[in-house]
Amino acid sequence: KAMHVAQPAVVLANSRGTASFVCEYASPGKATEVRVTVLRQADSQVTEVCAATYMMGNELTFLDDSICTGTSSGNQVNLTIQGLRAMDTGLYICKVELMYPPPYYMGIGNGTQIYVIDPEPCPDSD
């Protein structure tokens, strides 16, 4: 079953290569457990950046090697992606799945274009 997911159109990563954006979904049922996946689309290829699962009202659980962190509040998930470089600039899509209880719902946002600018190296001070 389809579900509406909203996310900002554009986000600029900070100088440390960290970008944050909110992913909001319209829950049609009583969601107990939600899975959030961040997908990166570049050159017509889609790759999974990270995925988390969480029970409503609890913290997001990412896998150990994840470059993402996040918090949830109601039907909003605040996602942060770390360690980004200029080459990681691209469209980051938020996919939300209501895993539990049935029925299963899934929604995909239109994507957030994240721009990453590598910081200029500091000039030698000698």
Partner: antibody
Framework: QVQLQQPGAELVRPGSSVKLSCKAS????????MHWVKQRPIQGLEWIGN????????HYNQNFKDKATLTVDKSSSTAYLQLSSLTSEDSAVYYC???????????WGQGTTLTVSS | DIQMTQTTSSLSASLGDRVTVSCRAS??????LNWYQQKPDGTVKLLIY???KLHSGVPSRFSGSGSGTDYFLAISNLEQEDIATYFC?????????FGGGTKLEIK
């Protein structure tokens, strides 16, 4: 601390019904789904079904939909598993377990050993 | 239904050893894999959830890994109290299903 208390054993006759109990304490009973699991030596662990104590919504494993009925009593924070038309195949240990994130079960009862025998 | 297979039904190891228990799903379960310990008296405890997350109170010598269809539970520095049967369980799709269990014994 979280506790799920189950009777140790039940002995019943073939063809009859039995209602197994699981009394929860140490947490808000209506905030977590309760699941039931059957264990037999050869078949291993089998998921029977689950119930949301807040509104009694249930989901069953198709293999148990004509065998098991799940209910709750919110006033006593107790979950129940009723098994009908009992046969020797129903002889097993039955566990109640609280649902946690990623559909894991973070706390289990001690299990009730059900023996169906004439 | 998703079939969960633990190919090794029993495993013998010495105290202090590192032991790995494996579990395979019949289809991708997207890291919704949980591990349980069942003691001889029937007591069941959650060890690991969502592939690698250690449940509160579980010793750090237990760890989980894997993805897709293949998952692993590792126990380092094996202790006497670890003698038990270990079950995997998938939480991706109803009905939830369990592996057949791996019984861990001391050499």
């Amino acid at each position: 601390q979280v506790q799920l208390q189950q009777p140790g054993a039940e002995l019943v006759r073939p063809g009859s019904s039995v209602k197994l109990s699981c009394k929860a304490s140490g947490y808000t009973f209506t905030s977590y789904w309760m699941h039931w699991v059957k264990q037999r030596p050869i078949q291993g662990l089998e998921w029977i079904g689950n119930i949301d104590p807040s509104d009694s919504e249930t989901h069953y494993n198709q293999n148990f939909k004509d065998k098991a009925t799940l209910t709750v009593d919110k006033s006593s924070s107790t979950a129940y598993l009723q098994l009908s038309s009992l046969t020797s195949e129903d002889s097993a240990v039955y566990y109640c377990a609280r649902r946690y994130t990623s559909s894991s079960f973070d706390y289990w009862g001690q299990g009730t050993t059900l023996t169906v025998s004439s | 239904d998703i079939q969960m297979t633990q190919t090794t039904s029993s495993l013998s190891a010495s105290l202090g050893d590192r032991v790995t228990v494996s579990c395979r799903a019949s289809q991708d379960i997207r890291n919704y894999l949980n591990w349980y310990q069942q003691k001889p008296d029937g007591t069941v405890k959650l060890l690991i959830y969502f592939t690698s997350k250690l449940h509160s109170g579980v010793p750090s010598r237990f760890s989980g890994s894997g993805s897709g269809t293949d998952y692993f539970l590792a126990i380092s520095n094996l202790e006497q109290e670890d003698i038990a049967t270990y079950f995997c369980q998938q939480g991706n799709t109803l009905p939830y299903t369990f592996g057949g269990g791996t019984k861990l014994e001391i050499k």
